[in-house]
């Protein structure tokens, strides 16, 4: 049979997902119901590996599968009739498959830094990069991330900095390729903690008796993490700035003369049965010298006529020595210190003085 050459196809339409493209087209020849169509699908930059699809007669659509996500392709469509008589020119169309979403990403806190490290494996296929969105309440930040390669299963990471401590962030990462955006992948991550900010003031110390004092102080600000505990520290020495080293000294050490500074009382804030908001500042009042014991610290009687100063340590993380039961490990804890109070001088023991006078 004799056939005239088919006209070229036109109006090629493409709809895509990550790994397939559905193509449809038109041919306006009266004889088009007798045509089949030959499709050549070529990945950009890889002409040696074209996929060929031939449709059944009269079919003007086809779905091509096993494509690579986020990749650019060109399709050429020839109309053909009889024994391979083809249209002179193919209809041509470039298209991109949709990029693949990131399967998931993990968050890691950065110790003592208001930052998060995000880790992920590259999604399959090609990408031009990623959109990163970080949001917490009214604050948000959008940035671009560089592209990655899925070929070797490498773990990719980025550090998100300039965040707040102990704050929950909504994080979204969107794959981009060929000007297309995948569905965002979301996670909620919370930043870590660090030493609390040292308070501006110092505790208030007042004499109650010849062997006890009252120490009053305000709770530390919780912007670097919730305050887990406070330690009340006394000294009879020079009131320099205390260091974490003093947290190992007890009343017993003080009595033995091993140290002029010691921890006399420990408050675990969780035990107060209420959560402290960032703005809520609690007031504390401690009786020092009442012979109570908190963990490894004995709150022993003070020396009559002694001169004492008080300081408070606040902890966002309190760690105890595994071997010295109940004693704080200052190096492993997240702690900051108030300044020392002014000195208070205890009165003499009136009863003892009276007794001494009679003899």
């Amino acid at each position: 049979a004799q056939y005239t050459r088919p006209s070229n196809v036109s109006n090629i339409d493409v709809s895509t997902n990550t790994t397939a493209a559905t193509l449809s087209w038109q041919n306006f020849d009266d004889a088009s119901p007798t045509y089949s169509y030959c499709l050549l699908i070529e990945k950009a930059g890889n002409s040696s590996n074209a996929t060929q699809v031939v449709t059944d007669i009269g079919i003007t659509d086809a779905t091509v599968t096993e494509l690579i996500p986020g990749s650019s392709y060109t399709v050429e469509i020839f109309a053909q009739v009889g024994d391979g008589i083809k249209s002179l020119e193919p209809g041509r169309k470039s298209f991109c498959t949709d990029p693949a979403s990131m399967a998931s990403f993990d968050c890691e806190v950065v110790p003592k830094e208001p930052a998060l490290v995000l880790k992920w494996t590259c999604p399959p296929g090609a990408n031009a990069g990623f959109e990163l969105e970080v949001s917490s309440g009214a604050w948000n930040n959008a940035t671009h991330l560089e592209s990655c390669s899925s070929e070797n299963g490498t773990e990719y990471r980025t550090e998100v900095t300039y965040l707040n401590f102990s704050t929950s962030y909504n994080i979204s990462i969107t794959t981009v390729s060929c000007g297309k955006m995948a569905a965002p992948t979301r996670n909620t991550c919370t930043t870590g903690i660090t030493d609390p900010p040292p308070p501006d003031g110092s505790p208030n110390i007042t004499s109650v008796s010849h062997n006890s004092v009252k120490v009053k102080f305000s709770g530390f600000e919780a912007s670097h993490g919730p305050i887990k505990a406070y330690a009340v520290i006394l000294t009879t020495g020079e009131a320099g700035h205390p260091s974490a080293d003093v947290l190992k000294y007890t009343y017993e050490d003080f009595k033995k003369g091993a140290s002029d500074t010691y921890v006399t009382y420990l408050i675990r804030t969780e035990e107060k049965g209420r959560s402290q908001s960032l703005s809520e500042v609690l007031k504390y009042e401690i009786d020092v010298g009442n012979e109570s014991t908190t963990l490894g610290y004995y709150n022993g009687k003070l020396e009559p006529l002694g001169s004492y100063r008080a300081c408070v340590a606040g902890f966002t993380n309190i760690t105890f020595h595994p071997q010295n039961k109940g004693l704080i490990d200052g190096a492993e804890s997240y702690v900051s210190f108030s300044r020392y109070s002014d000195a208070v001088s205890l009165p003499q023991d009136v009863a003892a003085a009276h007794h001494h006078h009679h003899h």
Partner: antibody, heavy 117, light 107 residues
Framework: EVKLVESGGGLVQPGRSLKLSCAAS????????MAWVRQAPTKGLEWVAY????????YYRDSVKGRFTISRDNAKSTLYLQMDSLRSEDAATYYC??????????WGQGTLVTVSS | DIQMTQTPHSLSASLGETVSIECLAS??????LAWYQQKPGKSPQLLIS???PLHDGVPSRFSGSGSGTQFSLKIRNMQPEDEGVYYC?????????FGAGTKLELK
Amino acid sequence: EVKLVESGGGLVQPGRSLKLSCAASGFTFSNYYMAWVRQAPTKGLEWVAYITNGFGSTYYRDSVKGRFTISRDNAKSTLYLQMDSLRSEDAATYYCSTVPLGAFVSWGQGTLVTVSS
Amino acid sequence: DIQMTQTPHSLSASLGETVSIECLASEGISNYLAWYQQKPGKSPQLLISHANPLHDGVPSRFSGSGSGTQFSLKIRNMQPEDEGVYYCQQGYKFPYTFGAGTKLELK
């Protein structure tokens, strides 16, 4: 095929309000960062506002901050720009656009906003 | 704000000629640079994003190069349909900013 169609432009007096819409089709609207870009008559292009896909975070150029509000309705595949306290310098053709990785990829045909008393 | 300085302001080229448009960013923008073509009465069209990848359907006679602060758009084999105004734009940092445009005419 990506299609963006802006509407809502018109003549408005200074100090008054106008709300622009952009109807999107041919792509998964909820996946995309979207933006408004404007072009004053015979002038260049100026980015106006931007909204993300994940949490709908918004960003504005300083001159419109506090007066313009970008929003999106993913169920309707529509982007909006609420423009309040309009000034003569806001007169322009307003385009909506998809904006992956900081590039304005697909554009609508634009809607003209005229601000005059 | 990052300033985008485009040169030249206008140029005319003969059919088949190669033309170059330069764009200078006032600070480093990595490769977050796009080029657009706008014809009278029409919307801008993306030509190139990320400094060099051609957008879908853009003829291969267009090419982009550069990174950091200096970028250029090259049009080889000038065609009548290439007439229009060309804009560069940085998408690195808010506010996203455009160059003032380069008007390209056919001689």
